[in-house]
């Protein structure tokens, strides 16, 4: 078979949820491999995912060093086999990613209702404080640790017997709501960062209903 040209990567896309961050690109390589480099605006280019035939690279370890920084990545295409490099003067081809600021852009993962507890006509609903891959002093921070009061949760709740939904909001991970005595309620929560312009809301949590295992009832 004849020689082919090395082709530059394209469609570089950041996929990030709760700071787990992967750069994806195309095309699937033929007679070429990729190496990814990542940098902050003021920093040096650090090579990652060396000589790979994958079309994705996990950059979580780099971006969690400072989630408020803005990052840029680039994907180099290196000839590997019966190919000619189309870069000039022996320089490999590369393509830049869009800029990515984890704090402003990482998707909020689907939250989970950890528990709910009824005391009389009050129900306390607790949202699981999900662990991220962001570290401080060698321990992993939770979503609340990272976002603080920038993160709120919206609770949707309704009587099992009807479809009319009510909402409540909290800037902690707990809700205390009033309910009608003797009625069973269902709950779903959503994570929200109101100050954001993109990726403001998570998907809704799975629905949890009273009378199921997660709940506790006290007179």
């Amino acid at each position: 078979s004849g020689t082919t040209n090395t082709v530059a990567a394209y469609n570089l896309t950041w996929k990030s949820t709760n700071f787990k961050t992967i750069l994806e690109w195309e095309p699937k390589p033929v007679n070429q491999v990729y190496t990814v480099q990542i940098s902050t605006k003021s920093g040096d280019w650090k090579s990652k995912c060396f000589y790979t035939t994958d079309t994705e690279c996990d950059l979580t370890d780099e971006i969690v060093k400072d989630v408020k920084q803005t990052y840029l990545a680039r994907v180099f295409s290196y000839p590997a086999g019966n190919v000619e490099s189309t870069g000039s003067a022996g320089e490999p081809l590369y393509e830049n990613s869009p800029e990515f600021t984890p704090y402003l852009e990482t998707n909020l993962g689907q939250p989970t209702i950890q528990s709910f507890e009824q005391v009389g006509t009050k129900v306390n609903v607790t949202v699981e404080d999900e662990r991220t891959l962001v570290r401080r002093n060698n321990t992993f921070l939770s979503l609340r640790d990272v976002f603080g009061k920038d993160l709120i949760y919206t609770l949707y709740y309704w009587k099992s017997s009807s479809s009319g939904k009510k909402t409540a909001k909290t800037n902690t991970n707990e809700f205390l709501i009033d309910v009608d005595k003797g009625e069973n309620y269902c709950f779903s929560v959503q994570a929200v960062i109101p100050s954001r312009t993109v990726n403001r809301k998570s998907t809704d949590s799975p629905v949890e209903c009273m009378g199921q295992e997660k709940g506790e009832f006290r007179e």
Epitope: V33, T35, D44, F50, T53, D61, Y78, A80, N82, G90
Partner: antibody, heavy 117, light 106 residues
Framework: QVQLVQSGSELKKPGASVKVSCKAS????????MNWVRQAPGQGLEWIGM????????RLNQKFKDRAVLSVDKSVSTAYLQICSLKAEDTAVYYC??????????WGQGTTVTVSS | EIVLTQSPDFQSVTPKEKVTITCSAS?????MNWYQQKPDQSPKIWIY???NLASGVPSRFSGSGSGTDFTLTINSLEAEDAATYYC?????????FGGGTKVEIK
């Protein structure tokens, strides 16, 4: 021009430790991964691992994970390889080499480490 | 780890003869380099990315292969080519080298 200059020969007793240095010049030291490779007398090449000077991230060959430590001193643009609990089989020439793509190829001159009682 | 097996270990060849060195990998490799090393010298990159000649390498050298089988070929051996040649894979960590092939001039 890029240069990697390594420390001089070492004679060590079994069980001792050795620390080999590799001083880089002619480029931004913190921006390139630095490899360490060794070659026993009359034998082939063996990759020990590599370190990224800017943040000291290391990739280590599992064979050496309990006995080799890679480190850097950014202030003097120097990379270090320390091997502890030396054995006769660690007698080798140890090379540092800048990680580069393609024709770029920069190696230190090698440091001979002899382990003998 | 990926084990690279070179053959032959040693080759004694007359000038202008063709030399073929093979490197067989224990599992599939997508990025293979070849190094040349002369006595008391550091290794030098000779072929990178399976088939690309490093700068200054004469065109009588070539590299080929894919998957688990790779070849370095010297089309017409010259005296200056006497050296040991090593293959190296950079497809998965730990990066590994072949055992080397020593090429001697008859």
């Amino acid at each position: 021009q890029v240069q990697l200059v390594q420390s001089g020969s070492e004679l060590k007793k079994p069980g001792a430790s050795v620390k080999v240095s590799c001083k880089a010049s002619g480029y931004s030291f913190i921006s390139y991964w630095m490899n360490w490779v060794r070659q026993a007398p009359g034998q082939g090449l063996e990759w020990i691992g590599m370190i990224y000077p800017a943040d000291s991230e290391t990739r280590l060959n599992q064979k050496f994970k309990d006995r080799a430590v890679l480190s850097v001193d950014k202030s003097v643009s120097t990379a270090y390889l320390q091997i502890c609990s030396l054995k006769a089989e660690d007698t080798a020439v140890y090379y540092c080499a800048r990680e580069d793509y393609g024709s770029s190829d920069y190696w230190g001159q090698g440091t001979t480490v002899t382990v003998s009682s | 780890e990926i084990v690279l097996t070179q053959s032959p270990d040693f080759q004694s060849v007359t000038p202008k003869e063709k030399v073929t060195i093979t490197c067989s990998a224990s599992s599939s490799v997508s990025y293979m380099n070849w190094y040349q090393q002369k006595p008391d010298q550091s290794p030098k990159i000779w072929i990178y990315g399976i088939s690309n000649l490093a700068s200054g390498v004469p065109s009588r050298f070539s590299g080929s292969g894919s998957g688990t089988d790779f070849t370095l070929t010297i089309n017409s051996l010259e005296a200056e080519d006497a050296a040991t040649y090593y293959c190296q894979q950079k497809s998965s960590f730990p990066w590994t080298f072949g055992g080397g092939t020593k090429v001697e001039i008859k």
